[in-house]
């Protein structure tokens, strides 16, 4: 708490300007009117206040708006935003994308702070869903944003928003998240032709089921090994050697380098060695000729 003291004669602030950096903390408390500060918040950003001085200014705003700041003030907080706690931010009602952008700009280049995470959460909840413009904005500032959401949160992303997603935005997504995003991407890109469709859907294929991979194998897509290695193991296992060959096209030669890694390793174990040999890559570990392949999952379903 800053002690209440009378403002010295002639020091009452008529406007928020650079002369205030020469005020001591108690002078700022005594001489700056909170309502004046609220209406001239945009000027604070251009003034090199110390952190201690910013504490005083924040205290004045807190007293003026105990229930939370109005958006007109929030939009112009500038670097005073860095002084806000998640508890402060939970009191806000941020509805304008411009306000969100202004505050994300302040934190640009830094890791997502608890304040920013709370701000985004408040904003998205207020909107009811993660629309395209919001997603555009968030992934521009935080490419990993999408992958920080739970599968439940991702379920509120409308398919139309998927157009805003760039491949790098999905780099840190795990299979559970891609399981949610893939069907949305499939819906979003459904009217595109073969090659264009593949370019767009490629980053989401970590959530694709076997049937969709089989369908892609009929379209000469030439999937690269990096994409293949991110596919769900359970989706890859039922693919035949011929289907994998068609799916990868000229990239099929890359299987040799990956034969000890999932999903390639597990897929090899499910193929007949005869079939693997047709690839001419020297892949070993397939089912020897003359052995009977039992589909145990099918047997369990029947019993």
């Amino acid at each position: 708490e800053v002690e209440k003291t009378a403002c010295p004669s002639g020091k009452k602030a008529r406007e928020i300007d650079e002369s205030l950096i020469f005020y001591k903390k108690w002078e700022l408390e005594a001489c700056v009117d909170a309502a004046l500060l609220a209406t001239q918040m945009d000027r604070v950003n251009a003034i090199p206040f110390t952190y201690e001085q910013l504490d005083v200014l924040k205290h004045k705003l807190d007293e003026l708006y105990p229930q939370g700041y109005p958006e007109s003030v929030i939009q112009h907080l500038g670097y005073l935003f860095l002084k806000m706690s998640p508890e402060d931010i939970r009191k806000w009602n941020v509805t304008s994308l411009e306000t969100l952008k202004a505050l994300l700009e302040v934190n640009k280049g830094h890791e997502m702070s608890p304040q920013v995470a709370t701000l985004i959460d408040r904003f998205v909840k207020g909107r009811g869903q993660l629309d395209k413009d919001t997603l555009d904005t968030l992934t521009a500032f935080y490419p990993g944003y999408l992958c920080s959401l739970s599968p439940e949160e991702l379920s509120s992303v409308p398919p139309s928003s998927i157009w805003a997603v760039r491949p790098q935005d999905l780099d840190t997504c795990d299979p559970r998240q891609l399981d949610v995003l893939y069907p949305k991407a499939r819906l979003a890109f459904q009217n595109m032709n073969g090659s264009e469709y593949f370019v767009k859907i490629q980053s989401f294929l970590g959530g694709a089921p076997t049937e969709d991979l089989k369908a892609l194998s009929q379209q000469n897509v030439s999937m690269d090994l990096a994409t293949f290695m991110k596919l769900r193991t359970d989706a890859v296992l039922p693919l035949t050697v011929a289907e994998v060959q068609k799916l990868l096209g000229p990239h099929v030669e890359g299987l040799k380098a990956e034969e000890r890694h999932r999903p390639v390793r597990d897929w090899i174990l499910r193929q007949r060695q005869d079939d693997l040999d047709t690839l001419g890559l020297g892949l070993q570990g397939g089912i020897p000729n003359g052995y009977l392949v039992l589909d145990l999952s099918m047997q369990e379903a029947l019993s």
């Epitope: 300007d17 950003n45 251009a46 090199p48 670097y79 700009e105 640009k108």
Partner: nanobody, 114 residues
């Protein structure tokens, strides 16, 4: 990141003048540029500030003697110090706010001998 390079400090007789300069290398828009000083055993204090609008303000102790100015094209701020006194002896450091972040220079020593 904003890199700040100060120059112009040195040893001067009381009553003499010095001109400090601070060049900021950045593509960001600069909001304000200011000079602070810290005398030995004392806290750092603001000396002068100039905003992006060109308005200036000074500490009472230097009013009428020091002038702050900036060259926006060169992203440089200057501090013209006249009628220097021994109590002006300190390390003078440049401070810049660019895109809502504050950056400090390394500081330049100013020594005023009586």
């Amino acid at each position: 990141q904003v890199q700040l390079v100060e120059s112009g400090g040195g040893l001067v007789q009381a009553g003499g003048s010095l001109r400090l300069s601070c060049a900021a290398s950045t593509t960001s828009s600069i909001n304000s540029m200011s000079w602070y000083r810290q005398a030995q055993g004392k806290q750092r204090e603001p000396v002068a500030v100039i905003t992006d609008r060109g308005s200036t303000s000074y500490a009472d102790s230097v009013k009428g003697r020091f002038t702050i100015s900036r060259d926006n094209a060169k992203n440089t701020v200057y501090l013209q110090m006249n009628s220097l006194k021994p109590e002006d002896t300190a390390i003078y450091t440049c401070h810049v706010i660019a895109d809502w972040r504050g950056y400090w220079g390394q500081g330049t020593q100013v020594t005023v001998s009586s």
